[in-house]
Interface confidence: low
């Protein structure tokens, strides 16, 4: 799978979709995870509804949401309030018994907010409590990465 | 409607390949998984694995993995498996067999199967 | 993987009896969509498996109502109300929750 990058603003939403061919999917549900490291497992951060027949309604986990077309074969996420720490590689799936496909790879890239003026030293630390606007869909801007880009840099 | 028919009886010395096919017609080749099942004299079955000729993604059964390649050809409507290094283990029917196409909860029996291609390994 | 256990080894049967095959899978095969995907074949002498049940209880396009199929999470029976000399061969179970996909060992129903 080539991996494709959706970048967003930090503090706005980022829409993410991965098209699949819904004749081979037909029932079943889907996720969408994270990557942990290169070659580690894909930890699942929102996967859909229970009931596939109702896979259109928008389940959420966090700021997180998740809705499946399954007649046009597009699984959309929604990241709500993108912060920094949300940068990196993900999954959709399509799962199937114990198992899952990979629809998509996708690298999430979050760029700085031009109207924040806040030091670009400072951190912003999961888990502290902040209030944030509704999830409106925002235009995502998606390329390919090319060959031989890495998604992940080298560790030292 | 639906027909899957494979290639003839093969006798092969040890150690060498084969390319089994199964010529598919009568429905969306492309858009309806192709299984590979192994059946030995007088025994069960066994799911080697399948392939979705769309776009060529395949399973494997693990013990099958290192020397079953399964491949698929749209523009001819046919399926292939391959099998290397092949033992006396190997001598077998093998069938292809087509899952039931997908519809609501109706996914993943296999519904129409090849008349099977008997293949005999000995030197 | 999920093993499928499949009893009696041979069911010898007369004409017209009612026949009932067991098969037990090592684990649920309730799919996540709620499904369950366990299917019964046939497969007579020198030829293909058949599809004769899908999905637990489903019968095949063609297949008498003589079939039936029953049973949830991981016990399975199938039964054939008035056995004819055309329904002896093997019967298999398979259930396709997970990959790989697995078979019970075989059923073969003859004749007493």
């Known amino acids: 799978h080539n991996t494709t990058v959706f970048q967003g603003v930090a503090g706005q939403s980022l829409q993410v979709s991965c098209p699949y061919d819904s004749m081979k999917h037909w029932g079943r549900r889907k996720a969408w995870c994270r990557q942990l490291g290169e070659k580690g497992p894909c930890q699942r951060v929102v996967s859909t509804h229970n009931l596939w027949l109702l896979s259109f309604l928008r389940a959420w986990n966090g700021s997180t949401a998740i809705t499946d077309d399954t007649l046009g074969g597009t699984l959309t996420i929604t990241l709500r309030n993108l912060q920094p720490h949300d940068a990196g590689l993900y999954q959709c799936q399509s799962l199937h018994g114990s198992e899952a496909d990979t629809l998509r790879k996708v690298l999430v890239e979050v760029l700085a907010d031009p109207l924040d003026h806040r030091d670009a030293g400072d951190l912003w630390f999961p888990g502290e409590s902040e209030s944030f606007e509704d999830a409106h869909v925002e235009h995502s801007i998606s390329r390919s990465l090319l060959e031989g880009e890495i998604p992940f840099p080298p560790t030292s | 409607q639906v027909q899957l028919q494979q290639s003839g009886p093969e006798l092969v010395k040890p150690g060498a390949s084969l390319k089994i096919s199964c010529k598919a017609s009568?429905?969306?080749?492309?858009?309806?998984?192709m299984n590979w099942v192994k059946q030995r004299p007088g025994k069960g079955l066994e799911w080697i694995g399948r392939?979705?000729?769309?776009?060529?993604?395949?399973n494997y059964n693990g013990e099958f993995r290192v020397r079953a390649t399964l491949t698929a050809d749209t523009s001819s409507t046919t399926a292939y498996m391959q099998l290397s290094s092949l033992t006396s283990e190997d001598s077998a029917v093998y069938f292809c067999?087509?899952?039931?196409?997908?519809?609501?909860?109706?996914?993943?029996?296999?519904?129409?199967w090849g008349q099977g291609a008997s293949v005999t390994v000995s030197s | 993987d999920v093993v499928m256990t499949q009893t009696p080894l041979s069911l010898p049967v007369s004409l017209g009896d009612q026949a009932s095959i067991s098969c037990r899978s090592s684990?649920?095969?309730?799919?996540?969509?709620?499904?369950?995907?366990l299917h019964w074949y046939l497969q007579k002498p020198g030829q293909s498996p058949k599809l004769l049940i899908y999905?637990?209880?489903n019968r095949f396009s063609g297949v008498p109502d003589r079939f039936s199929g029953s049973g949830s999470g991981t016990d399975f029976t199938l039964k054939i109300s008035r056995v004819e000399a055309d329904d002896l061969g093997v019967y298999f179970c398979?259930?396709?929750?997970?990959?790989?996909?697995?078979f019970g060992g075989g059923t073969k129903l003859e004749i007493k």
């Open positions: 392939i979705y000729p769309g776009d060529g993604d395949t």
């Open positions: 398979s259930q396709s929750t997970r990959v790989p996909y697995t």
């Open positions: 009568g429905y969306a080749f492309s858009s309806s998984w």
């Open positions: 999905k637990v209880s």
């Open positions: 684990q649920s095969l309730v799919h996540s969509n709620g499904y369950t995907y």
């Open positions: 067999a087509r899952l039931l196409r997908n519809q609501p909860g109706e996914s993943y029996a296999m519904d129409y």
